[in-house]
Interface confidence: low
Amino acid sequence: QRFAQAQQQLPLESLGWDVAELQLNHTGPQQDPRLYWQGGPALGRSFLHGPELDKGQLRIHRDGIYMVHIQVTLAICSSTTASRHHPTTLAVGICSPASRSISLLRLSFHQGCTIASQRLTPLARGDTLCTNLTGTLLPSRNTDETFFGVQWVRP
Amino acid sequence: QRFAQAQQQLPLESLGWDVAELQLNHTGPQQDPRLYWQGGPALGRSFLHGPELDKGQLRIHRDGIYMVHIQVTLAICSSTTASRHHPTTLAVGICSPASRSISLLRLSFHQGCTIASQRLTPLARGDTLCTNLTGTLLPSRNTDETFFGVQWVRP
Amino acid sequence: QRFAQAQQQLPLESLGWDVAELQLNHTGPQQDPRLYWQGGPALGRSFLHGPELDKGQLRIHRDGIYMVHIQVTLAICSSTTASRHHPTTLAVGICSPASRSISLLRLSFHQGCTIASQRLTPLARGDTLCTNLTGTLLPSRNTDETFFGVQWVRP
C-alpha cells in the first residue's frame, strides 16, 4: 500500500532523517559485555541527529525502519590471536525496553580481526540498542576501525 | 534540532540524492597505493549522480552526511595467500583538501580475500575520497567483487 | 543533471521508499544453489514494503537505484570447516528477466563463517534478485545471522 495519495506534499519535518554515527568510548566492566559509545562534533566525525546516548547506549527517538551498521576491529590482533581467542562474537540488539529485547545482528570473528555488517530493521521510539562483544579480545578505539551507526530510512 | 518547521514543503532539488557507485579502473604506479575508479552507464552498472571523478578519485559536490561503502576482493587469492602477504590493508579517507585529510574507514584482510564495510560520515563540497590498498596483492577488477560508492543521506 | 528545478515540490508518492528485509526460509534442492527467502511481520522483523516475493526470490516493483545488502552465516561452521569446504561462495544477482541477468555482488567465505556486504545498483520494475550459495555448507536460519534486503535510494 502506498504511503499517501499521489501529489500529497511532504513536509520536511516528516522526512525524519534521524541519523547517528558513534565511536567507541570504552568497554564495560568484567561481567558487562556491552560496548559503550560516544558521539559529537567535538570528538571528530561522530554525530547524533535525533537519536540520543543513554549511558553509552543508543536510544531511538523516532519510529521507523532504520539501517543499522557496525564495524568492530579487535585491537592487538592477528588471525592467530583471533582464532586462539575464539569465539569472539559481536551482537547488536534491542536491550531495552525488556519487552522488545531481541538480537538484530550477530557475527563471529573466527580468524579475522574485523567484522562489519548492516541491516534494515524496524525500531520504535525508546528502543535502546546495545552492542555486546563477548570474548577476551579488546576492541580498537581508532575511529576508522570501530564505529556504529543508524540511519532512518522510512516510516 | 529539527531541520525545518513542520509543514515546510520540501523542494525536490534540496533532497540532494547525490549518489555514486564506481568500479575499479586500475591500481596506481608502484609508490602510489591509491585505487583508481571509473563509473558511468557505458561501463555497466556504475554511475555518478552529483559526485565527480577527478583522476580516478571521487570528489563530492554537495555538503552533507554520506553513507560510504566499499568492497574490495583480492585477485588470485586464497586464505593462505592472504595470510602470507599480510598485512594487506584498505583505507578510505579524505585526501584532499589537505586540511581535511583523515582516514574514514580501515580494514585488514588477514586470512580473508574480501573486505566489505560501510559508514556514515560528514563530507563537504570539494572533499576528494581516496582508497588506499597497501600490500603486494592486487585487487580484482570484477565489477561484482570490487566496488566503491557513496550516498547522500541528509544535510 | 539535477532531478528537478529548484522549488519543485515533491509528492510523497514519488519518494518511493520501497524497502524489504528478508529472512532465510530454506535452501533449494540439490542442483539449485538459490537461497529462498521469506518476509512479513508474522515472521518477526522481516518486511516487504513495495517489493514482492516470487517463489522465495525478491522482485522489484519500482525503478530506481537501490542499496542491496546481505549477510549470510554458515551453520555448524568453524574457520577449519570453512577452509576445508572451500570454495563456498555467495552471489547476488538479477536472475530474471533473462535479458538483464547479471551478477551484482559476490563473496567467498575462505576461512570465515560469515560474509556481509552491500552495494548500490540500478534495478528496474520486474527485476528478480537471486542469491546463490555454492558449496556444501548450509546457511544458518537464525534471523540475526542471515538476512537480505533492499532499499530504494533515488530514481
Partner: antibody, heavy 122, light 111 residues
Amino acid sequence: EVQLVQSGAEVKKPGESLKISCKGSGYGFTSYWIGWVRQMPGKGLEWMGIIHPDDSDTKYSPSFQGQVTISADKSISTAYLQWSSLKASDTAMYYCASSYLRGLWGGYFDYWGQGTLVTVSS
Amino acid sequence: QSVLTQPPSASGTPGQRVTISCSGSSSNIGSNYVNWYQQLPGTAPKLLIYGDYQRPSGVPDRFSGSKSGTSASLAISGLRSEDEADYYCATRDDSLSGSVVFGTGTKLTVL
C-alpha cells in the same frame, strides 16, 4: 586466583633511582591494564598512570607525566614503576592495580597489589 | 588537589544508614561512570561499586551507588563495625586527557 604481588619496601636517598615491580598471576596478564596509584602518608589516592602489557600502550596522569616511567615485560607478567631521581616528596605507598577493562574505563580496578612503601630520606 | 570532592568524615551507629557524597563536574562525573573503593586500615583499596551502581561479586547489597548529574553517592545501610574505613570515589576526567581522578576520600567512623 588472581594475584598482584609487589616488590618489597625500599628506603632510598634523594637523587637515587628506583624501579619497583608488580607481578601478576592467575589470569591472562596481557589482557589486563595495570595501573599505578600513589598514597602519601595520611593522604588520599592519586592515579599515576596505566599500561597495557601486551603492547605497552601507556597513559600518564598529567601530574606524573615526566616524573615517573611505567613499563612492562609481558614475558614475565610484570609491570614496573621507576624513578630516575627520587625526591623526599616521593615518599609514599605505591599500589599497582589491574583493570580487565578494554580501554581506560574511568578508574575501575578490580584487583590490587599489597603496596610497596617507598621512603626517600637523606 | 582532587577535582572530586568528598566530605572528610562521616559517622553512624551500627544498623544505621549513612551516605557519602562525591561532587564533580560535567567533564568527569557528568560524562563518565563512577566507581567506589573501600580502604580498610593498613590494607590496599578494594573495589566496592563500579559503573555508578553495580556491585562486584562478593560485595554485600548493603552497599549501593547512585549518580545524578555531576554528583554521585555511596549509601551503606545496616552499618557494621567492619565498615569503618576510608571510602574513595573515582572516575575518568575528559578534561585531563581521560586521566583517572580519585575523590578526596571520606573517613567513616562507626560509633
